[in-house]
Amino acid sequence: AIVFIKQPSSQDALQGRRALLRCEVEAPGPVHVYWLLDGAPVQDTERRFAQGSSLSFAAVDRLQDSGTFQCVARDDVTGEEARSANASFNIKWIEAGPVVLKHPASEAEIQPQTQVTLRCHIDGHPRPTYQWFRDGTPLSDGQSNHTVSSKERNLTLRPAGPEHSGLYSCCAHSAFGQACSSQNFTLSIADESFARVVLAPQDVVVARYEEAMFHCQFSAQPPPSLQWLFEDETPITNRSRPPHLRRATVFANGSLLLTQVRPRNAGIYRCIGQGQRGPPIILEATLHLAEIEDMPLFEPRVFTAGSEERVTCLPPKGLPEPSVWWEHAGVRLPTHGRVYQKGHELVLANIAESDAGVYTCHAANLAGQRRQDVNITVATVPSWLKKPQDSQLEEGKPGYLDCLTQATPKPTVVWYRNQMLISEDSRFEVFKNGTLRINSVEVYDGTWYRCMSSTPAGSIEAQARVQVLEKLKFTPPPQPQQCMEFDKEATVPCSATGREKPTIKWERADGSSLPEWVTDNAGTLHFARVTRDDAGNYTCIASNGPQGQIRAHVQLTVAVFITFKVEPERTTVYQGHTALLQCEAQGDPKPLIQWKGKDRILDPTKLGPRMHIFQNGSLVIHDVAPEDSGRYTCIAGNSCNIKHTEAPLYVVDKPVPEESEGPGSPPPYKMIQT
């Protein structure tokens, strides 16, 4: 049965931010997992895509992601299907809108002492709370004949008088964030002496070193005064300009012109109109310097013919918002057809091989233009250049099996031996072109081989047999150095195998014939009685018709095997006295003697002052201590053989002499006295 280890759960999400609907499945066999949105399968895009079994959102969209999501796991073999619990997003968002006149129906109907209602068209979820501003100053409920209905987003002025004239704006904030009105409303209630806005400055975005113009006009009777201020409250006039506004000009009609705009000129400009009576009207506009960031790199994409694919171009951050378009081969893509642009996406429907190539996403605004290329490869199913062939390979030599294919992109080749994937190791190597090399062919390599060549578009495979031809070889190879015991019978075997049974013969390396007491019997060299003259170099030659001959060289040494002339005896020594363990061996070549004590070889160069090994092989230990007790092994060895003999050493406390004992009394046990 299919079991959900993790189910998707409904959750809060923020518009344009990341989100993840988790889904994890456990099943006895392979299952494939997909997602439904309101019952319809979810297609992967760069914004919303499967990540493992889970569904990942790069940027939540309140319109496209509203509805019920469900994770579905299906076993394509059994047809069993399991569906997770439903999950949906509570998407939090806020969106700016204009301030509009709700009552009366038109601006022309606004008269002093009438009721005026303005509405703030900022919307969001959860419902935001609203704040109203007149000429940039916050309005609090109940002050100066106005009421704010947050529920209806309305500002009511009852009655409206000249003192209410001004630029009305609103801002709203919620758990998601904050937004301010995209277009403000200028309320003008005539009091001839009050300054009234005729033309309000607008926010301006300009490219560096371009010019910016702010228009500002007030009317009143008598005419009002007009003054421009930059951020730090520094007045701007044609006679006194701040150092960083040297290129500012104020025209008679109130317009402010800035030429060769630099970053330091960016900021808030205030236009202040003052009538004979009434409050000053302060209008604000911001000068933004246009900017455009770099675009992120595209990963190369590999698509299969006949499919539909989309590539999303995420526009770079910029001011103003950059416009985006796609080009291919220098031509802008249309908004419909088989290969077209939809929003920021490049859409390729029913992909053809000819669609492969470089596509360019362009983004541009006042600050300039950015572009980023994406390389699209249309994958093709591999085709054969050379299939693997049934082959006879020689044992011990390298063997090659071809698997040459062509496709776009370059195909991946894997090899199987006895239906098991070959992993590259010291014996098997797969070349870039797909050829398999068996570094040193063994008889076990005689079996089935199969190669598979794949691209995302599909795969092809072919198999071939390998038959291994046995090489001519010694089984086993004779030891290159061997010893024979002087005056004894000895045999030196030599055997070989090949595709045909080889004949085997021995000869002396110098080419001389074997003496009559030495026989060569089917590859075994037999010495009836070894003499000193039998030492030397011999060659075993194995040969057959089809494979020629092979040779093995053996150096025979004649030796007198080791015997012990003197062996160490079981020895007991008083603590603090000296122990002598004697050992003498004879043989030819003359044996060397080594001692082993307490399970380690006693290195003559590292014995310390208490121990010494004599030329004749005897071991002496001075000032013995209880820890010197144990088994000591005398090892005699030469180039032909090795023998050992051992004896225990006991270290005992010296007894305290009793009154009755005379000076000549013998010790209670046999020991060395020093």
Epitope: Q392, Q419, T447, V468
Partner: antibody
Framework: QVQLQESGPGLVKPSGTLSLTCAVS?????????WSWVRQPPGKGLEWIGE???????NYNPSLKSRVTISVDKSKNQFSLKLSSVAAADTAVYYC??????????WGQGTLVTVSS | DIQMTQSPSSLSASVGDRVTITCRAS??????LNWYQQKPEKAPKLLIY???SLQRGVPSRFRGSGSGTDFTLTVSSLQPEDFATYYC?????????FGQGTKLEIK
């Protein structure tokens, strides 16, 4: 040196299932050998039944494929033959054999299975 | 299935004789041919593999040759222990098939 030893009942009833096991010694069943079954009806020639590799891949004689199952037990170092719906014509000496390089270099001594009621 | 036909079906010879057994495949099998020797009440024993390669431990008087569809097994000088039934087998395609056998008897 690989040695093979067949075991199983010598008498099977018609329409029953013949079950034989081949114990492998002197080598591992996970080596590069293919492990085969061959049979020889009394006084007749040799007939190849099928083969298995330690990974579980099998090849069967199409004439017997619908009735044959060969399996491998790595933990016991043995492989088995099951032949269902047997008839008198399935009476034979059954050999297990193995090899590599496209030959059968190692054989068991064979076991006679008689199909009779 | 590939049919393997051996000839002769039986043959009488004396110790020291040279004998030849032939095996023909119904379609080409390259060199995927093996020869086996079977004595009464015994399991078959591999003599030759890959048409001409001598199995380890087999005397050199046994020799195999041929490729494609026609193959021969030659025993150069018969020994008493060589009297037995000989089978050829193809391992080129499944099912692997044996010849019907050649019985070599003492004259």
């Amino acid at each position: 040196q690989v040695q093979l030893q067949e075991s199983g009942p010598g008498l099977v009833k018609p329409s029953g299932t013949l079950s034989l096991t081949c114990a492998v010694s002197g080598g591992s069943i996970s080596s590069d050998h293919w492990w085969s079954w061959v049979r020889q009806p009394p006084g007749k020639g040799l007939e190849w039944i099928g083969e298995i590799f330690h990974s579980g891949n099998t090849n069967y004689n199409p004439s017997l494929k619908s009735r044959v199952t060969i399996s491998v037990d790595k933990s016991k170092n043995q492989f088995s033959l099951k032949l269902s719906s047997v008839a008198a014509a399935d009476t034979a000496v059954y050999y297990c054999a193995s090899g590599y390089n496209w030959n059968l270099g190692y054989w068991g001594q064979g076991t006679l299975v008689t199909v009779s009621s | 299935d590939i049919q393997m036909t051996q000839s002769p079906s039986s043959l009488s010879a004396s110790v020291g004789d040279r004998v030849t057994i032939t095996c023909r495949a119904s379609q080409t099998i390259s060199s995927y041919l093996n020869w086996y020797q079977q004595k009464p009440e015994k399991a078959p024993k591999l003599l030759i593999y890959a048409a001409s390669s001598l199995q380890r431990g087999v005397p050199s008087r046994f020799r195999g040759s041929g490729s494609g569809t026609d193959f021969t097994l030659t025993v150069s000088s018969l020994q008493p222990e060589d009297f037995a039934t000989y089978y050829c087998q193809q391992s080129y395609s499944i099912p692997y098939t044996f010849g019907q056998g050649t019985k070599l008897e003492i004259k």
